[in-house]
Interface confidence: low
């Protein structure tokens, strides 16, 4: 995967929150849930109230990237999804407020959001070949593809 220094000269400026309180379901219709204080996991839920609700914030790149760059926050908290390395769980990082500017190693907080029909992909800005993914009996992690599941459906207005 690409080292952090690969994009260290690019600056990302926060624009606005573009989605509030949405749920992410993977291709097996498993919802992302909180596993503990640090990690997320996926489970098939009867009651979507147990699913994590996310907010999505958009960032603008200093190099005028065509891709939509986003940060993912657990709604009503100060917890942000943070990438580690390949096959490592994504972390929930606590920050007092949404970062106004992100650069260098902090790009592990950012993801490129791509949509193909109803499928949504979140590629790590710090590791551009890796996606947010679910894996059987494991945490939500960063992965390059199968057997991990990298495509998600966004469910909105679940209130």
């Amino acid at each position: 995967s690409a080292p952090f220094s690969f994009l260290s000269n690019v600056k990302y400026n926060f624009m606005r929150i573009i989605k509030y309180e949405f749920i992410l379901n993977d291709a097996l219709n498993q919802s992302i849930i909180r596993a503990n204080d640090q990690y997320l996991t996926a489970a098939a839920l009867h009651n979507l109230d147990e699913a994590v609700k996310f907010d999505m914030g958009a960032y603008k790149s200093s190099k005028d990237d065509a891709k939509i760059t986003v940060i993912l926050r657990i709604s009503k908290t100060q917890l942000y999804v943070t990438a580690q390395d390949e096959d490592q769980p994504v972390l929930l990082k606590e920050m007092p407020e949404i970062p106004k500017t992100i650069t260098g190693s902090e790009t592990n907080l950012l993801f490129f959001w791509e949509t193909h029909g109803t499928k949504n992909y979140f590629t790590s800005v710090a590791h551009p070949n890796l996606f947010i993914a679910t894996k059987q009996d494991y945490w939500v992690c960063l992965a390059g593809g199968p057997p991990s599941i990298t495509d998600f459906q966004i469910l909105e207005n679940q209130a």
């Epitope: 849930i33 909180r34 503990n36 204080d37 657990i74 009503k76 908290t77 929930l92 606590e94």
Partner: antibody, heavy 122, light 107 residues
Amino acid sequence: QVQLVESGGGVVQPGRSLRLSCTASGFTFSMFGVHWVRQAPGKGLEWVAAVSYDGSNKYYAESVKGRFTISRDNSKNILFLQMDSLRLEDTAVYYCARGRPKVVIPAPLAHWGQGTLVTFSS
Amino acid sequence: DIQMTQSPSSVSASVGDRVTITCRASQGISSWLAWYQQKPGKAPKLLIYEASNLETGVPSRFSGSGSGSDFTLTISSLQPEDFATYYCQQTSSFLLSFGGGTKVEHR
């Protein structure tokens, strides 16, 4: 089954220190955020402090900030509350509590200990 | 910090009565609210989480409703073992806070 057992309470003089412990069993302690909640005699519940699963994030009520320190030893399944500069208004039963699984620190508290009493000598 | 205000502070009721307790948050907390029952000399017991979800093993006569800043705990038909003090707690902020409590006592 989940068990939380507090210890370390007792009679203390104002201005002195006391260290409470809470020993956990029946679950993977290192996976959960844990809390201290207190209850003064005849009064309601007051949340005191919380610590994240790995001890890296700590949160305190305004009434104890700067005087109390929450910590944990995951290798021994123990939660601590170091109470310094104790005041008469700190008289209370102190409970440790654990959240439901799958939730972060701001959690409903599904499992509680029996409590340990901290009182003051006149 | 988020302040939680419960009312009434006490209520007199008889077995079979329907009892309603309200809780108001000083700011919007979505559905991040829990209800507890406490009996004298005992630790609190979680009844309801996220405003309306019944904790495992809690009788269905207990129910919770509300979102935003106004919430309600209802006991549909009070049983002898339900005489106790009830507390609400917000779980929206990292700094948790409880309501002042409502004592349900014999009429």
